[in-house]
C-alpha cells in the first residue's frame, strides 16, 4: 500500500498557502483528486509529489494515491480543506443524475471542518426542502439525498453558518430519472386482419411506458408511414397511439403491418398480416377422417375447422340417417374461436348406440354462401353367432350364421364330449371357413355372415362348436347332437346388449 | 397563476361514499405534493394526508387511514379524495392545498354535508 | 401526535397596534434535515387559508413586511408591527416536520 506524506487523515490549511503531499510506493504510483488549478505534479520512479504554492478553496477534495500494478489494489488518501472565510463550500458538480431509488451526492464539499455544526441543505431562492428529503451530511464529500424521488429533481443550495450568517454555495441542479424497466409496451390491434377489397380497415398500433421520452412507429412491409400520433397518460403511463384508417382498401395495402418503439432501453416489436381478397370466403376442413369407425358404447368428437370472412351467419350439425329422424342435441355441440377468421366446430357423440350410426354434416353460411362437410361414421360391433342343423340336398348340414362388423371370419370345431366351448385338449378338429357366404351388407349396418358344414354322421357324444371373430371381439355357438334331436348352447357370455 | 378549483359542494347519505376532486393550474402539477385537510364547523384543522403526484405515494394521518383515499390523474393534472362510510361525523369543509416545503396555495374548498 | 398549543385564543386589538401570538409545539419540531417547518396562516371569514411565514421566520411572497415569526425548538411567535383593518381573521400555526403534520386551535384577531 502506498504512504501519503504527510501522514495524516486531513490536513488545514488557509489560501494562498504551500501545499507539498508525497506519495511513496513501491513501484510507480498515481494521484487521482477533484479537478483543481495551480497543481503541479513531479514524479520520480516510486514516488510522486503533488505540490501547489497557491492553494485556494477549490483545492479543498480528496486526494487519492494509489499504486497500478498493485494486484490488490491498494491506495492511500488524504483530504485537504483550504479554508477561505468568504468560500465555505468548494462545489465539484453543477447538475447530478440519478435514477429513482438511489442515493444523490450533491458534492459540496466544506472548506473549513469547524462550519460542519451549521451546515443545511436548502432549495434555491431560501425555499426550505421537502419534508419528505431525507439527507445526510460528509464534509468530505457533501450532501447526500437518501432514495431520491423524481419530485425531488430540484435545485440545491449547501448552507453553512458563517459568524451568525447564512453563507449558500452556487446551485447544484439534481435531475431523478425514473427507473425505465425496459423498451415500451406494445399492442397492435387486431392481430390480424382480413377484408375484401373496397371495405374499410383500421389498424393500431399503441406503445406505453413509465418515461415519456420514447417513439413509436407503424410500418407496412418496411416502409414507415406517416400517422398523426395522438398521446395520453393514464395509470401512471405515457401513451402514443398511431391509427391507421383505410376507407377503401385494395391488393397494395395487404402485406406484414409491424408497431416498433423504442426508447434508451432497446426496441420492441410485433407484427401483424393483412389479406385482402376479390370475395367473401368460407372453408371447411377437418384434421380428421372423414370416414370415422367406431366401437358400439364408445364416443368420439367429430371436429370441424371453419376459415371465413365475413363472419358465419349461421351453422348447425345435422344427422343424414339413415336409422332414424333424430338431430344431434344442441348441448352436443361446441364452437370455440382459435381467432378472428378460424373456428373449430365440435360435436360430442358419448356412449354411441346402434340408431347413432350414419352420416353426419356440418353445414355453415355466410355471404360467399353455404358449405358442408359429411363425416360418415359406422359403428363396431363383436360378432353374433347361431347355429341349427338342416338338411341341404338330403345332406345334414350345419349351418352358422355369424352377424357383426367388421365382418366376421369363421371358424368350425368339433371335440369330444358335451360342452359349452371346446377348449384345446378336447378338440379333434377344425375347419377354417376363408370365404363365408355374405347374407347382408348395407352401409352402416352389421355384416352378416353364413357358414355351412356337411356332416354325414352326427357322433352323439360330441359338440360341434362355431366360432366368429373379427376385430372387437369374438362370439360361438355350441351344437351338442342328441338322440331326440340337436341341442344347441349359445355361451352366456356372448349375448349382446347395446 | 396557481389554482386549485375544487368540486362543488355535496349532500350525500349517511353509509355512502364521495369523491372530491381538485384540479390544478399554473404550475407544473408533478413537481410538488398535494395535501388535504379538514375543517369542521367551528373546529380546527386536520391534515388528512398528501400525495405524491408521479408516484400515486401517499402518507396519511392514521385518524383517516381507511376513511380516504387519495388518488391523482396527471394527464388532467387532477387529484382526487374519496371518502367513505360516511357518518355526519364526516360533515366538514375539504381542502386541497399544493406543498412546497410549505403549503402555499389552497383550494377554495368543498362543503360536504352528510345527512339522511 | 404533536400538539400545537396557541394563546391567545381571541385577540381584541386596535388599529395600528401591535399583536403577538404565540405558538407552542408538544415536543420539538427541527426535523432531521435540519429544518423547522413552522408556518404561520391566515384564514379570513368564508376564505381558505393564505401563507405568511414558513421556516418559522421567512415571509411568503407578497405578505408584507409588517407580518414577522421568530423562535425555535418548541416556541414560536408571530407578530403584526402595525395591525391593519385586512389583517382580521383566524391566525393558524402550524408544524410540518412530524407526520401527522398538526395546526394550533387558532387565533382570533378582531377589532377592540
Known amino acids: 500500500i502506498p504512504v501519503i506524506e504527510p501522514s495524516v487523515p486531513e490536513l488545514v490549511v488557509k489560501p494562498g498557502a504551500t501545499v507539498t503531499l508525497r506519495c511513496v510506493g513501491n513501484g510507480s504510483v498515481e494521484w487521482d483528486g477533484p479537478p483543481s488549478p495551480h497543481w503541479t505534479l513531479y514524479s520520480d520512479g516510486s514516488s510522486s509529489i503533488l505540490s501547489t504554492n497557491n492553494a485556494t478553496f477549490q483545492n479543498t477534495g480528496t486526494y487519492r494515491c494509489t499504486e497500478p500494478g498493485d494486484p490488490l489494489g491498494g491506495s492511500a488518501a488524504i483530504h485537504l480543506y483550504v479554508k477561505d472565510p468568504a468560500r465555505p463550500w468548494n462545489v465539484l458538480a453543477q447538475e447530478v443524475v440519478v435514477f429513482e431509488d438511489q442515493d444523490a451526492l450533491l458534492p459540496c464539499l466544506l472548506t473549513d471542518p469547524v462550519l460542519e455544526a451549521g451546515v443545511s441543505l436548502v432549495r434555491v431562492r431560501g425555499r426550505p426542502l421537502m419534508r419528505h428529503t431525507n439527507y445526510s451530511f460528509s464534509p468530505w464529500h457533501g450532501f447526500t439525498i437518501h432514495r431520491a424521488k423524481f419530485i425531488q429533481s430540484q435545485d440545491y443550495q449547501c448552507s453553512a453558518l458563517m459568524g451568525g450568517r447564512k453563507v449558500m454555495s452556487i446551485s447544484i441542479r439534481l435531475k431523478v430519472q425514473k427507473v425505465i424497466p425496459g423498451p415500451p409496451a406494445l399492442t397492435l390491434v387486431p392481430a390480424e386482419l382480413v377484408r375484401i377489397r373496397g371495405e374499410a380497415a383500421q389498424i393500431v398500433c399503441s406503445a406505453s411506458s413509465v418515461d415519456v421520452n420514447f417513439d413509436v412507429f407503424l410500418q407496412h412491409n418496411n416502409t414507415k408511414l406517416a400517422i398523426p400520433q395522438q398521446s395520453d397518460f393514464h395509470n401512471n403511463r405515457y401513451q402514443k397511439v398511431l391509427t391507421l384508417n383505410l376507407d377503401q382498401v385494395d391488393f397494395q395495402h395487404a402485406g406484414n403491418y409491424s408497431c416498433v418503439a423504442s426508447n434508451v432501453q432497446g426496441k420492441h416489436s410485433t407484427s401483424m398480416f393483412f389479406r385482402v381478397v376479390e370475395s367473401a370466403y368460407l372453408n371447411l376442413s377437418s384434421e380428421q377422417n372423414l370416414i370415422q369407425e367406431v366401437t358400439v358404447g364408445e364416443g368420439l368428437n367429430l371436429k370441424v375447422m371453419v376459415e371465413a370472412y365475413p363472419g358465419l351467419q349461421g351453422f348447425n350439425w345435422t344427422y343424414l340417417g339413415p336409422f332414424s329422424d333424430h338431430q344431434p342435441e344442441p348441448k352436443l355441440a361446441n364452437a370455440t374461436t382459435k381467432d378472428t377468421y378460424r373456428h373449430t366446430f365440435t360435436l360430442s357423440l358419448p356412449r354411441l348406440k346402434p340408431s347413432e350410426a350414419g352420416r353426419y354434416s356440418f353445414l355453415a353460411r355466410n355471404p360467399g354462401g353455404w358449405r358442408a362437410l359429411t363425416f360418415e361414421l359406422t359403428l363396431r360391433y363383436p360378432p353374433e353367432v347361431s347355429v341349427i342343423w338342416t338338411f341341404i340336398n338330403g345332406s345334414g348340414t350345419l349351418l352358422c350364421a355369424a352377424s357383426g362388423y367388421p365382418q366376421p371370419n369363421v371358424t368350425w370345431l368339433q371335440c369330444s364330449g358335451h360342452t359349452d366351448r371346446c377348449d384345446e385338449a378336447q378338440v379333434l378338429q377344425v375347419w377354417d371357413d376363408p370365404y363365408p357366404e355374405v347374407l347382408s351388407q348395407e352401409p352402416f349396418h352389421k355384416v352378416t355372415v353364413q357358414s355351412l358344414l356337411t356332416v354325414e354322421t352326427l357322433e352323439h357324444n360330441q359338440t360341434y362348436e362355431c366360432r366368429a371373430h373379427n376385430s372387437v371381439g369374438s362370439g360361438s355357438w355350441a351344437f351338442i347332437p342328441i338322440s331326440a334331436g340337436a341341442h344347441t348352447h349359445p355361451p352366456d357370455e356372448f349375448l349382446f346388449t347395446p | 397563476e396557481v389554482q386549485l378549483q375544487q368540486s362543488g359542494p355535496e349532500l350525500v347519505k349517511p353509509g355512502t361514499s364521495v369523491k372530491i376532486s381538485c384540479q390544478a393550474s399554473g404550475y407544473t402539477f408533478t413537481v410538488y405534493y398535494m395535501n388535504w385537510v379538514k375543517q369542521s364547523h367551528g373546529k380546527s384543522l386536520e391534515w388528512i394526508g398528501d400525495?405524491?403526484?408521479?408516484?400515486?405515494?401517499?402518507t396519511y394521518n392514521q385518524k383517516f387511514r381507511g376513511k380516504a383515499t387519495l388518488t391523482v390523474d396527471k394527464s388532467s393534472s387532477t387529484a382526487y379524495m374519496e371518502l367513505r362510510s360516511l357518518t355526519s361525523e364526516d360533515s366538514a369543509v375539504y381542502y386541497c392545498?399544493?406543498?412546497?416545503?410549505?403549503?402555499?396555495?389552497w383550494g377554495q374548498g368543498t362543503t360536504l354535508t352528510v345527512s339522511s | 401526535d404533536v400538539v400545537m398549543t396557541q394563546t391567545p385564543l381571541s385577540l381584541p386589538v386596535s388599529l395600528g397596534d401591535q399583536a403577538s401570538i404565540s405558538c407552542r409545539s408538544s415536543q420539538s419540531i427541527v426535523h432531521s434535515n435540519r429544518h423547522t417547518y413552522l408556518e404561520w396562516y391566515l384564514q379570513k371569514p368564508g376564505q381558505s387559508l393564505k401563507l405568511l411565514i414558513y421556516?418559522?421566520?421567512n415571509r411568503f411572497s407578497g405578505v408584507p413586511d409588517r407580518f414577522s415569526g421568530s423562535g425555535s425548538g418548541t416556541d414560536f411567535t408571530l407578530k403584526i408591527s402595525r395591525v391593519e383593518a385586512e389583517d382580521m381573521g383566524i391566525y393558524y400555526c402550524f408544524q410540518g416536520t412530524h407526520v401527522p403534520l398538526t395546526f394550533g386551535a387558532g387565533t382570533k384577531l378582531e377589532l377592540k
Open positions: 392545498a399544493r406543498y412546497d416545503g410549505y403549503i402555499d396555495y
Open positions: 400525495i405524491d403526484p408521479n408516484t400515486g405515494d401517499s
Open positions: 421556516g418559522v421566520s
